[in-house]
């Protein structure tokens, strides 16, 4: 069954945590649907964003952070492992120095930590996708 | 009650027709939600687009056409009559020489016809909005 989109969930992250998302683009790639995943510092959507991950399907991925309300230096990738019309599985792992983004089991993007991952309080998944799975796995202490 | 998004409806347009849309952005303007309205030449979403109207809430509006699968010259406007968090009523009227876009009763954008409006067979409303009303009014013959 489908999860509501935008989908918002409280989360605490640290090295070893992984966020897993399963979904499908709502439109063909010609129409440039988007997927966005934001790691927020508060439960409010206006809060700062520790890690912003935005896919324009078929075109590009941009990653960034929003600090004290201002967007910082954008990182762009043309790598496009997503398939037109196909379900995707996205996993974002918190490594000691960066986020590692896997798409369908394949390491596809990395983003160096700008803000401590421990600052994350909420994850939001939204834009032009249907969502079937959202999970945060925590490292066993 | 809410209409499904993306929302797709068969439509035939000509001078005097008006498409009316009522909805609300799904996120605060800081997060740049989008609204998109596309007038397609076929019932298929990959078909050409006679009039493409995309709002990046709080930032800008772009209008364009997609002809033989290729995007043409984009028209951009910084006019932003939409209100953060507020419901909007959008009406797109087919005038003899252009589309006139009204937002909350106020004339806000125009787009000169590049393709005959009679070529439109389907309207799609999508991206980051909830949709409460969609109506196509036809000129009484």
């Amino acid at each position: 069954s489908l999860l509501p989109v935008p989908y918002t969930e409280a989360a605490s992250l640290s090295t070893g945590s992984t966020v897993t998302i399963k979904g499908r683009p709502l439109a063909c790639f010609l129409n440039e649907p988007y997927l966005q995943v934001d790691f927020h510092t508060e439960m409010k959507e206006e809060s700062d964003i520790v890690f912003h991950f935005q896919v324009c399907f078929g075109r590009r991925v941009v990653m960034n952070s929003r600090e004290y309300g201002a967007w910082k230096q954008q990182v762009e990738s043309k790598n496009m492992p997503f398939q037109d019309g196909q379900e995707f599985e996205l996993s974002i792992s918190v490594l000691p120095d960066k986020y590692q983004v896997m798409v369908n089991g394949q390491s596809s993007y990395t983003f160096d930590h700008r803000i401590k991952p421990e600052a994350v309080k909420m994850v939001q998944v939204w834009r032009d996708i249907s969502l079937t799975k959202f999970n945060v796995s925590y490292l066993k202490r | 009650s809410l209409l499904p998004v993306p929302y797709t409806e068969a439509a035939s347009l000509s001078t005097g027709s008006t498409v009316t849309i009522k909805g609300r952005p799904l996120a605060c303007f800081l997060n740049e939600p989008y609204l998109q309205v596309d007038f397609h030449t076929e019932m298929k979403e990959e078909s050409d687009i006679v009039f493409h109207f995309q709002v990046c809430f709080g930032r800008r509006v772009v209008m364009n056409s997609r002809e033989y699968g290729a995007w043409k010259q984009q028209v951009e406007s910084k006019n932003m009559p939409f209100q953060d968090g507020q419901e909007f009523e959008l009406s797109i009227s087919v005038l003899p020489d252009k589309y006139q876009v009204m937002v909350n009763g106020q004339s806000s954008y125009t787009f000169d016809h590049r393709i005959k409006p009679e070529a439109v067979k389907m309207v799609q409303v999508w991206r980051d909005i909830s949709l409460t009303k969609f109506n196509v009014s036809y000129l009484k013959r």
Epitope: S65, E67, Q73, D97, K98, D112, R114, A119 | -
Partner: antibody, heavy 121, light 107 residues
């Protein structure tokens, strides 16, 4: 071994210009963000400017914005700081520094020995 | 943009523990780095990402942070540790901020 060597400092009148250079060796220069940090006589460290690996993104402290321009030539392994409309308060020892990586908090792991800029009439 | 405040001077007896604080930063948010600077020399990175120690830095140097305070601890201070120490925090690019500096005297 890894080295950063600044040059181009000197005495200049208020309103004048200088161009500082920082020659890098012993590491893959094009893979690192680079920075200018200054230290006025008897004072603390002040971050001045930053440039990303490709040189397409540049950042400045408010105190120098609009007057200073950071740039780099990755083919020559050299970092630059063009300083215009100099003021007496720009008088300082100017260091070039390398970031440990693009990761926040890795700090500036290598520094040059600095080049002195004196703005005085 | 945070302003980082450090005490202007700290004294410690030889072999004792020195603690230098850095206040006013959002250290739940941003990492802190620490630099040592001796007279006439360039700064040297002694702590990065709150508590990381670069190779070649003695184990007696350690760092921690909590809330709005970061602390550099020198356990068993040596005469050669007498220097100015600066904290630095902020993001990776355009908002790096240095504290005002603390002079450590080893008695």
């Amino acid at each position: 071994q890894l080295q950063l060597v600044e040059s181009g400092g000197g005495l200049v009148q208020p309103g004048g210009s200088l161009r500082l250079s920082c020659a890098a060796s012993g590491f893959t220069f094009s893979s690192y963000w680079m920075y200018w940090v200054r230290q006025a006589p008897g004072k603390g460290l002040e971050w001045v400017s930053a440039i990303n690996t490709g040189g397409g993104s540049t950042y400045y402290a408010d105190s120098v914005k609009g007057r200073f321009t950071i740039s780099r030539d990755n083919a020559k392994n050299t970092l630059y700081l063009q300083m215009n409309s100099l003021k007496p308060e720009d008088t300082a020892l100017y260091y070039c520094a390398r970031a440990g990586s693009g990761v926040a908090g890795t700090g500036y792991d290598y520094w040059g020995q600095g080049t002195q800029v004196t703005v005085s009439s | 943009q945070p302003v980082l405040n450090q005490p202007s001077a700290v004294s410690v007896s030889l072999g004792q523990t020195a603690r230098i604080t850095c206040q006013g930063g959002n250290f739940g948010y941003y990492y802190v780095s620490w630099y040592q600077q001796k007279p006439g020399q360039a700064p040297v990175l002694v702590i990065y990402r709150d508590s990381g120690r670069p190779s070649g830095i003695p184990e007696r140097f350690s760092g921690s942070s909590s809330g709005d305070t970061a602390t550099l601890t020198i356990s068993g201070a040596q005469a050669e540790d007498e220097a100015d120490y600066y904290c630095q925090s902020g993001s990776s690019s355009d908002n790096a901020v240095f504290g005002g500096g603390t002079h450590l005297t080893v008695l």
